[in-house]
């Protein structure tokens, strides 16, 4: 069971300081951006991180959403990352959900975050280069200290 608590506005970056944004095709991508670019591309660069209480505490349970014309929420259904047009729900009556991730700081690096899927244990949000695009994907952690699954989360206010 997950119950919504509060929401924050955040900018999410990978460890190469590329900014996560949702493109016109609703794809989550990373791109080099100055602070000015980041502001100019808002609200596509501003993510609503909603925190949830968890009946089985396993870290901070969160959803990641973005509001352009409508609110879309990040999902890892079938291990494929996509944004689905939906509000983060108040309650989820299950111990796993495709839209719930456990946000945890990297041991020894309090400012670096990882997001583990609640549906697929051991699978994390990651940045992966595909041709000339840097995509947000779901990836099984295969090596300790994998930088591709680490992010910084900066609160908007």
């Amino acid at each position: 069971y997950f119950g919504k608590l509060e929401s924050k506005l955040s900018v999410i970056r990978n460890l190469n300081d590329q900014v996560l944004f949702i493109d016109q095709g609703n794809r989550p991508l990373f791109e080099d951006m100055t602070d000015s670019d980041c502001r100019d591309n808002a609200p596509r660069t501003i993510f609503i991180i909603s925190m949830y209480k968890d009946s089985q505490p396993r870290g901070m349970a969160v959803t990641i959403s973005v509001k352009c014309e409508k609110i879309s929420t990040l999902s890892c259904e079938n291990k494929i990352i996509s944004f689905k047009e939906m509000n983060p729900p108040d309650n989820i009556k299950d111990t796993k959900s495709d839209i719930i991730f456990f946000q945890r700081s990297v041991p020894g690096h309090d400012n670096k975050m990882q997001f583990e899927s609640s549906s697929y244990e051991g699978y994390f949000l990651a940045c992966e280069k595909e041709r000339d695009l840097f995509k947000l994907i779901l990836k099984k952690e295969d090596e300790l200290g994998d930088r591709s699954i680490m992010f910084t989360v900066q609160n908007e206010d």
């Epitope: 919504k4 509060e6 501003i46 108040d90 908007e156």
Partner: antibody, heavy 118, light 107 residues
Framework: QVQLQQPGSELVRPGASVKLSCKAS????????MHWVKQRPGQGLEWIGN????????NYDEKFKNKATLTVDTSSSTAYMLLSSLTSEDSAVYYC???????????WGQGTTLTVSS | SIVMTQTPKFLLVSAGDRVTITCKAS??????VAWFQQKPGQSPKLLIY???NRYAGVPDRFTGSGFGTDFTFTISTVQAEDLAVYFC?????????FGGGTKLEIK
């Protein structure tokens, strides 16, 4: 910086129509919902409706569906509200206001004072 | 549409007092509630969004809390410049709605 510029006042005759304007600057006009809010003297705030300039999708409060029509001109980054069949009940301050990233309305115009009088 | 019932309508307080305003939604609005301050002759200003987040530049004496149907806005230590009308607002669903307002007057 973000600015929403509205004319200070409009005086119109009962039964006529008026088109109020709101010129936006300092941000990507097509990326945020624009809202219109009515405030009668000494009264509270009433939400009229909103428009998403990127797609021109609109929502209205039922009370204002036959009174207000929201439009935009993306080339000039201007939002408009047409108010029709005006009566003294329509005399009020009308604000345009922009959505924050997810919650609230963080930028407001100075408001246009509409006076309906013969 | 969702009705936001705001109480009290008026508050007469002294500088330094603690003030609490409540808003009750007619159905759950999650945490999609904002609070605004409107000073005489001015446009409203956003103070709190997502029920509890202080907007940039807002002094920390202003706080908000609540979830679902019951929301609270508090000014921990009222100052003379806080003379204004305060409104709650739900942006959970369309049509968006405002509370009736609370007029804060300083003795």
């Amino acid at each position: 910086q973000v600015q929403l510029q509205q004319p200070g006042s409009e005086l119109v005759r009962p039964g006529a129509s008026v088109k109020l304007s709101c010129k936006a600057s300092g941000y990507t006009f097509t990326s945020y919902w624009m809202h219109w809010v009515k405030q009668r003297p000494g009264q509270g705030l009433e939400w009229i409706g909103n428009i998403y300039p990127g797609t021109v999708n609109t929502n209205y409060d039922e009370k204002f569906k036959n009174k207000a029509t929201l439009t935009v001109d993306t080339s000039s980054s201007t939002a408009y509200m047409l108010l029709s069949s005006l009566t003294s009940e329509d005399s009020a301050v009308y604000y345009c206001t922009r959505d924050y990233y997810g919650g609230g309305l963080n930028y407001w115009g100075q408001g246009t004072t509409l006076t309906v009088s013969s | 549409s969702i009705v936001m019932t705001q109480t009290p309508k008026f508050l007469l307080v002294s500088a330094g007092d603690r003030v609490t305003i409540t808003c009750k939604a007619s159905q759950s609005v999650s945490n999609d509630v904002a609070w605004f301050q409107q000073k005489p002759g001015q446009s409203p200003k956003l103070l709190i969004y997502y029920a509890s987040n202080r907007y940039a530049g807002v002094p920390d004496r202003f706080t908000g809390s609540g979830f679902g149907t019951d929301f609270t806005f508090t000014i921990s230590t009222v100052q003379a410049e806080d003379l204004a009308v305060y409104f709650c607002h739900q942006d959970y669903s369309s049509p968006r709605t405002f509370g009736g307002g609370t007029k804060l007057e300083i003795k």
